[in-house]
Amino acid sequence: MAVTACQGLGFVVSLIGIAGIIAATCMDQWSTQDLYNNPVTAVFNYQGLWRSCVRESSGFTECRGYFTLLGLPAMLQAVRALMIVGIVLGAIGLLVSIFALKCIRIGSMEDSAKANMTLTSGIMFIVSGLCAIAGVSVFANMLVTNFWMSTANMYTGMGGMVQTVQTRYTFGAALFVGWVAGGLTLIGGVMMCIACRGLAPEETNYKAVSYHASGHSVAYKPGGFKASTGFGSNTKNKKIYDGGARTEDEVQSYPSKHDYV
């Protein structure tokens, strides 16, 4: 039950996170004109990854796409790439996790396969979230650098007859949406990875036999039971020190430790 809840919650959190990453990527307000000391200009400028917008005081807004690819700063291209990779990985992760959900039955899919898929989607969500956080952070760093550069330019002597007022840009709403969304996707991914451990079936190679050694309460189980995560083939028999002799059925009737994670 706990596993199903963790997996379901992980899926929902990741879904919200990826929707947020998509929203942030599409938003125009990655950087907005700094209005700290009263607006210097009668127009408000804000920029996204794909276009730049100008809003006049009347409310009239006009946006222009960045129609060049080669003329754009490398950092902007890098941020675009990170966000797109994040979206693609997240989307694939969502698709995989839908089939991995314990509450959804697809044919005779084994728990080991579901565990596999849950872990895969979890890793995808983690990488997706990291990509979004990295993309947003790179852009934020770029803004901070440019902000202080333009502030320095404002206070240095301006030569020549024609002066230009530096427009400074600060963090736009999209950055905060991106950070939160990236964080949610990351959390969702971690939850999926945790759920994966609980999904792994507890298998036995063969019936365990209990030997009662005189004066000692030690059960030697030649076959032991292996906790298979469903990844790789672990055929080695392990001796299990149990601190007391029990039948295999007794041992297996106890809840798996993974159910409580």
Partner: antibody, heavy 120, light 113 residues
């Protein structure tokens, strides 16, 4: 059609205050900025400030800070400008104007102007 | 404040003549975000309020005759009247519509011979 009708000419004493009105019609009053412009006799135009009736936000030219106060009455779609501590160099024609939508902050409609004469 | 300088201060022309009025700003009025220049031209006839002629440096207001053309970018702007008519007798003002406070040029008085 859009109209801005200003109050009549004013003759005031130095040190006194005066309130000029600008009654608007033909458009949604709360959705457009109202600007006020000063023109001294035979001289150029000077921007005083602007007021947004929708939110009550005002921006002033520093030269008129403390001199002009912009307000509006939404129920009657009327904008007001109060001029205080009047001096002789406040004698001028004052225009109220509307900022157009999608016209680069330009003023597309103007009132006929109110003449203010400061004299003892 | 942005200084708007208009030249000449007055101009006498004959009807049908082409006339060019100049306006220079102390700072660039070009907005890089939308590639528009926030400069406006007004016409003020004697005893009347000013009238909007051109905004965004080159966009003609509706109802304005097409003999009026605005051009220029950055800091240098011109208003061209291709064929002056008697009714064009007026004072022409340019205005910075970008930086606060909005500032007007001193005006160019167009007189007809």
């Amino acid at each position: 059609q859009v109209q801005l009708k200003q109050s009549g000419a004013e003759l005031v004493r130095p040190g006194a205050s005066v309130s000029l009105s600008c009654k608007t019609s033909g458009y949604i009053f709360t959705s457009y900025w109202i600007h006020w412009v000063k023109q001294r006799s035979g001289q150029g135009l000077e921007w005083i400030g602007r007021f947004y009736p929708g939110t009550g936000t005002a921006y002033y030219n520093e030269n008129f800070e403390g001199k002009a106060t912009l307000t509006a009455d939404r129920s009657s779609s009327t904008a007001y400008m109060q001029l205080s501590s009047l001096k002789s160099d406040d004698s001028a024609v004052y225009f109220c104007t509307r900022e157009g939508y999608g016209k680069g902050n330009a003023m597309d409609y103007w009132g006929q102007g109110t003449s203010v004469t400061v004299s003892s | 404040d942005i200084v708007m300088t208009q030249s000449p201060s007055s101009l006498t022309v004959t009807t049908g003549e082409k006339v060019t009025l100049s306006c220079k700003s102390s700072q660039s009025l070009l907005q890089s975000g939308n590639q528009k220049n926030y400069l406006t031209w007004y016409q003020q006839k004697s005893g009347q309020p000013p009238e909007l002629l051109i905004y965004w440096a080159s966009t003609r207001e509706s109802g304005v005759p097409d003999r009026f053309t605005g051009s220029g970018s950055g800091t240098d702007f011109t208003l061209t009247v291709s064929s002056v008519q008697a009714e064009d007798l007026a004072v022409y003002y340019c205005q910075n519509d970008y930086y606060f406070p909005f500032t007007f040029g001193g005006g160019t008085k167009l007189e007809i011979k």
